[in-house]
Amino acid sequence: GDLLIQKTIKKQVVLEEGTIAFKNWVKTGTEVYRQFWIFDVQNPQEVMMNSSNIQVKQRGPYTYRVRFLAKENVTQDAEDNTVSFLQPNGAIFEPSLSVGTEADNFTVLNLAVAAASHIYQNQFVQMILNSLINKSKSSMFQVRTLRELLWGYRDPFLSLVPYPVTTTVGLFYPYNNTADGVYKVFNGKDNISKVAIIDTYKGKRNLSYWESHCDMINGTDAASFPPFVEKSQVLQFFSSDICRSIYAVFESDVNLKGIPVYRFVLPSKAFASPVENPDNYCFCTEKIISKNCTSYGVLDISKCKEGRPVYISLPHFLYASPDVSEPIDGLNPNEEEHRTYLDIEPITGFTLQFAKRLQVNLLVKPSEKIQVLKNLKRNYIVPILWLNETGTIGDEKANMFRSQVTGKIN
């Protein structure tokens, strides 16, 4: 009996036309939502004038439906048993699941000022930038709508720069009508233990953002894993959002709509400094902000963001070192709300429920030449927003799963 079940599972999790896995893989049957909480800065003037701690108050959730578009350019390669695809991006605002509208205003760090002052280091350029920041009446902080902040706006200061710089900025700009990939993943036809594992991303086996093993593209995209998952496994996956591969470890057994699943979580060790976790040495890319690689819980992804000083962390700086959160008041990290988990049905390897949580931060540094940053006496890794992307198998699909998979085994 068990052998027959194994044979059926192996057949049905292959990523090719006609299998259960393929149908759900091309277009997810699960509704996926991305909730945003924006960190509204309460004391912009005191920070700019006196280098005070930044007082933030989170506002949210603002919810979007995401990942509703089918994979595009799905192409099987029979020679190397892979399937390649693009994952299109799309976001639809859900007013009924949000505390306000996309037109709500927030006081946030001026993205353009922080990024430009960091990237454009030439003395004369900094003088030009300073005069244009003043001319455009820009400052260290700005008021922006949710829509502008997330999806992009034309920046008044960058628009005055007499060079062909990018004048539209936004945390997720550009997003709609773009796609992630090309991904090329193993379809499992020749070897089911490789199904959904990424072979190449954007035509390469490495990212070119990190040194050594940190640069590798490991595992799947976390939507599914090879079947017959064991609790002892370390599940590797790649997340383009954070420009790196990461891993999850077993935490507990969970019953999801009558389906026994394994809850895998991202452990604090994955965010540790190289002092505590030597494997993380290659995620430390500079010595100053990281205090000689002793800070932890924030990841400098500037190399993946055209040099813009973007730092990824867990929400509210969960699992981060005290020096990171010290200049920020109003954060309350807790594991239950702010960690990432995957609920995996172990027989098929399908992720039936997940919560991906991350925070987007921007580095801002004192600058002698730029007036609005002149009074700063320290570097700040400024939280802009955090997000919670969730998906849960629907009741109908859960019934089907129970009757066709778990029911047959029990």
Epitope: Y120, Q121, N122, V125, P162, Y163, P164, V165, E306
Partner: nanobody, 120 residues
């Protein structure tokens, strides 16, 4: 490849004049802001004069205002620094710099420098 070659430095008496030239190649000269910096031993490089582009913003350090003039000839891919009423404190290595911005990148190039010595 990008090259910036300074010339025109030398020994001059206080009150004298010199004209520095910087010949550029390997990039679209007219798209770049051109600057002159100077450095004395143990000190940081100091911005002396800069010019955004022909007809664009020019900048002079307070210490050289009224004495130094920056100019450029886009047809010859050359930037000049006319230095009049030279003082002993103008003694330094003078460097030519070319910079432009594109997207989120800064392209910043330097010459090897030319020595200017003001002494009697």
């Amino acid at each position: 490849q990008v090259q910036l070659q300074e010339s025109g430095g030398g020994l001059v008496q206080p009150g004298g004049s010199l004209r520095l030239s910087c010949a550029a190649s390997g990039f679209t000269f007219s798209n770049y802001a051109m600057s002159w910096y100077r450095q004395t031993p143990g000190k940081e490089r100091e911005l002396v004069a800069a010019m955004q582009s022909t007809g664009g913003t020019t900048y002079y350090a307070d210490s050289v205002k009224g004495r130094f003039t920056i100019s450029r000839d886009d047809a010859k891919n050359t930037v000049y620094l006319q230095m009049n009423s030279l003082k002993p404190e103008d003694t330094a290595v003078y460097y030519c710099n070319a910079v432009t911005l594109q997207g989120w990148s800064e392209y910043d190039y330097w010459g090897q420098g030319t020595q200017v010595t003001v002494s009697s």
